[in-house]
Interface confidence: low
């Protein structure tokens, strides 16, 4: 249905004096032109008293007729002032003016809330020429009004560089309440108060709000919009929504879930991403966060060896990125690893424990108590040592590397020997007489060569001179093949 706002033909003529020839209802317009713009509003209203010349913005023509009579002021005629209608209805309203024929090319433009309406609006201008004047009716129609069509509409016409402006026509579109603020999902602490907000607008006003919790109304009496619901606290998840009522009916907001924060679920899928002699890189998949962001995680590591004392090492890390490199571990050892994460409520249970092993490493200390002495009868240097403590071998010993450097006047030569793991003595041939021999020893595993012991020096005299005093040091070492004794 199109609601039409039109001017009454009685008791006033549509185009009152002094121009002869009022427009009859059976007149056919000489010309009907679509306006440069067009539009679709829809509203209902009662016409005010139309027909009287507009007293506001008028143009006084300076041109005179043949008889030199001054022309009367030009003004839009009064029309309906206020149109109220429901959303999706159609509406049509118009403004009219009588213009002396001496003015050519007059156009009427439509404006809404101070902005010209251009583009696809349904505006039509009709011209009804007579002997001295032309009646112009500008119609504006909206086939299905929306809330956005609310506003003040006016017509404008330019004559003689003067602008003529009609009285405003106020369009008020009424419909179901429209939410401007709906409640939002929240994660809350158990038994702790929180607020939900709901706001809706018309027209028509007022808009009243009812709150609904888990399908049951919370408030018996409605509250005027906006409404804030204070919930004293929840012990379990709940769904809230609000109903907005006005004279046109009811609109229901989206339902929002209010979750109760809880401790997280334990992490899952703890896995070993990389393993070295002294570190293990693990990753895990976080469990459900209990509706509260994770803050940090704790990695718990214990030796899997049943003979260990069972103490647990704790490593704390940020929750992200679900990776952690556990350091300072023993080589070639087995560990049980579990992960737990916390949010603001507390710690999760520990993940399922996984078994992980470190690899072999190079020994971390050198052989101990290195002793070197000359066996002149066989022209050999005997070397003795103690193997590093098992804990510090960082793997299975495969042997030792011996470095011996021979220095005499202007000559220096280094030789490397390797010996098997079973002995703790070695014999090397004298390379140069009247020289200093410097010996260092290192332990070797499949993981690599450990540090060399501190150097031990012995002087090798010229033939015939014997020195039975051994040289020794309690320091570590590293070597290459040699004869084992």
């Amino acid at each position: 249905a199109i609601t039409e706002a039109r001017e009454e033909a009685k008791p006033y003529p549509l185009f009152p004096g002094p121009f002869p020839g009022s427009l009859q209802t059976d007149h056919t317009p000489l010309l009907s032109l679509p306006h440069a713009s067009g539009y679709q509003p829809a509203l209902m209203f009662s016409p005010t008293q139309p027909g009287r010349p507009h007293t506001g913005n008028v143009a006084i023509p300076q041109v005179t007729s043949v008889e030199s009579k001054p022309l009367p002021p030009l003004a839009f005629k009064h029309t309906v002032g206020h149109i109220i209608l429901s959303e999706h209805k159609g509406v049509k309203f118009n403004c009219s003016i009588s213009v002396p024929n001496i003015y050519q090319d007059t156009t009427i433009s439509w404006w809404k809330d101070g902005k010209e309406l251009l583009g696809a609006h349904h505006a039509i201008t009709q011209f009804y020429p007579d002997d001295e004047v032309t009646a112009i009716i500008a119609s504006f129609s909206i086939t299905s009004v929306q809330r956005s069509d609310n506003g003040s509409y006016i017509c404008k016409m330019k004559i003689n560089n003067e602008e003529i402006v009609s009285d405003p026509i106020y369009i008020e579109v009424q419909g179901l309440p429209h939410f401007t603020k709906q409640p939002e999902s929240m994660n809350v602490t158990r038994n702790t108060a929180f607020n939900l907000t709901c706001q809706a607008v018309g027209p028509p006003e007022p808009v009243n709000i009812f709150w609904v919790q888990n399908s049951s109304r919370v408030n018996e009496q409605p509250e005027k919009s906006p409404s804030v619901l204070t919930v004293p606290g929840l012990t379990e998840m709940a769904v809230f929504s609000c109903e907005a009522h006005n004279d046109k009916g009811l609109t229901v907001s989206k339902g929002v879930q209010i979750n109760i924060k809880a401790i997280p679920s334990p992490p899952t899928e703890v896995s070993i991403r990389n393993s070295t002699a002294h570190s293990i890189l693990i990753s895990w998949v976080p469990g459900f966060d209990g509706y509260s962001p994770f803050r940090n995680c704790s990695i718990q590591v214990k030796e899997a060896d049943p003979l260990s004392n069972g103490s647990v090492m704790i490593f704390n890390t940020s929750a992200l990125p679900h990776l952690y490199q556990i350091k300072q571990l023993q080589a070639l050892a087995n560990y049980s690893i579990g992960v737990s994460c916390m949010n603001e409520i507390g710690w999760s249970a520990v993940s399922p424990w996984i078994l992980a092993s470190t690899t072999e490493g190079a020994p971390s200390v050198a052989p101990l108590n290195v002793t070197v002495f000359l066996n002149e009868s066989s022209d050999n240097v005997d070397i003795r040592w103690m193997k590093p403590p098992t804990k510090q071998q960082d793997g299975e010993l495969v042997g030792y590397r011996i470095s011996h450097v021979w220095q005499s006047a202007g000559i220096s030569k280094e030789l490397l020997e390797e010996v098997g793991q079973n002995g703790s003595r070695a014999r090397i041939s004298v390379q140069v007489h009247n020289a200093t021999c410097t010996v260092r020893i290192a332990a070797v595993t499949r993981g690599g060569v450990g540090p060399f012991s501190d150097p031990v020096k012995i002087f090798i005299p010229a033939h015939g001179w014997v020195d039975y005093a051994p040289s020794s040091t309690p320091a570590p070492g590293n070597a290459d093949p040699v004869l084992i004794i």
Epitope: R273, N274, L281, S283, V285, P286, G287, F288, D289, P293, F294, S318, A319, L320, P321, H322, L323, Q325
Partner: antibody
Framework: QVQLKQSGPGLVQPSQSLSITCTVS????????VHWVRQSPGKGLEWLGV???????DYNEAFISRLSISKDNSKSHVFFKMNSLQAIDTAIYYC????????????WGQGTSVTVSS | QIVLTQSPAIMSASLGERVTMTCTAS???????FHWYQQKPGSSPKLWIY???NLPSGVPARFSGSGSGTSYSLTISSMEAEDAATYYC?????????FGAGTKLELK
């Protein structure tokens, strides 16, 4: 092929909230996490947060109080919401998939340019 | 948080020239979780080098990456016009995840 397509407003009023949807295809949100990163002339690339395949979230501490990331696995949608925006939050906001191996953002959305202004 | 410092901020290179840019971390990072991204104007960042030295499919072999601990670098053996872009380093090792400020590589 793997794609992440973003939709959201270009202009946000100060103190209002920003909502962006990242719609993914070519992979499942039950298998991969999705990160959110923003890029501004003043601060460069900034990591904001992530939603993991399990639905769990991790946020940059600097944004934890006003950031929310959620998803709908069945619709392949990831939802990003940041509250109380100010002019300093003007930036291009990206969603990006977290690869399985390497741990890196291997595919990125086209970005949503957001201006915070009245 | 781990701060990544890239240098230089801007550099230019001629066609065929060897290019190296660096990224220094404020604390040690496992090399498996250090990456480089390439970004061209109007486009999203692309994963360009992952885990310090690996190239995703589609990245030309003239690119390489190296480094460990706190010092990493990206090298282009022979500059080509299509390599002009901004390159960002990134650590995925500790929260919050962080990026470098970028090195803008221009064609001379």
């Amino acid at each position: 092929q793997v794609q992440l397509k973003q939709s959201g407003p270009g202009l946000v009023q100060p103190s209002q909230s920003l909502s962006i949807t990242c719609t993914v295809s070519g992979f499942s949100l039950t298998d991969y996490g999705v990160h959110w990163v923003r890029q501004s002339p003043g601060k460069g690339l900034e990591w904001l947060g992530v939603i993991w395949s399990s639905g769990t979230t991790d946020y940059n501490e600097a944004f934890i109080s006003r950031l929310s990331i959620s998803k709908d696995n069945s619709k392949s949608h990831v939802f990003f919401k940041m509250n109380s925006l100010q002019a300093i939050d003007t930036a291009i906001y990206y969603c990006a998939r977290k690869g399985h191996d390497p741990y890196a953002m291997d595919y990125w959305g086209q970005g949503t340019s957001v201006t915070v202004s009245s | 948080q781990i701060v990544l410092t890239q240098s230089p901020a801007i550099m230019s290179a001629s066609l065929g020239e060897r290019v190296t840019m660096t990224c220094t971390a404020s604390s040690s990072i496992s090399s498996s979780y250090f990456h480089w991204y390439q970004q061209k104007p109007g486009s999203s960042p692309k994963l360009w080098i992952y885990s310090t030295s690996n190239l995703p499919s589609g990245v030309p072999a003239r690119f390489s990456g190296s480094g460990s601990g706190t010092s990493y670098s990206l090298t282009i053996s022979s500059m080509e016009a299509e390599d002009a872009a901004t390159y960002y380093c990134h650590q995925y090792y500790r929260s919050p995840l962080t990026f470098g400020a970028g090195t803008k590589l221009e064609l001379k």
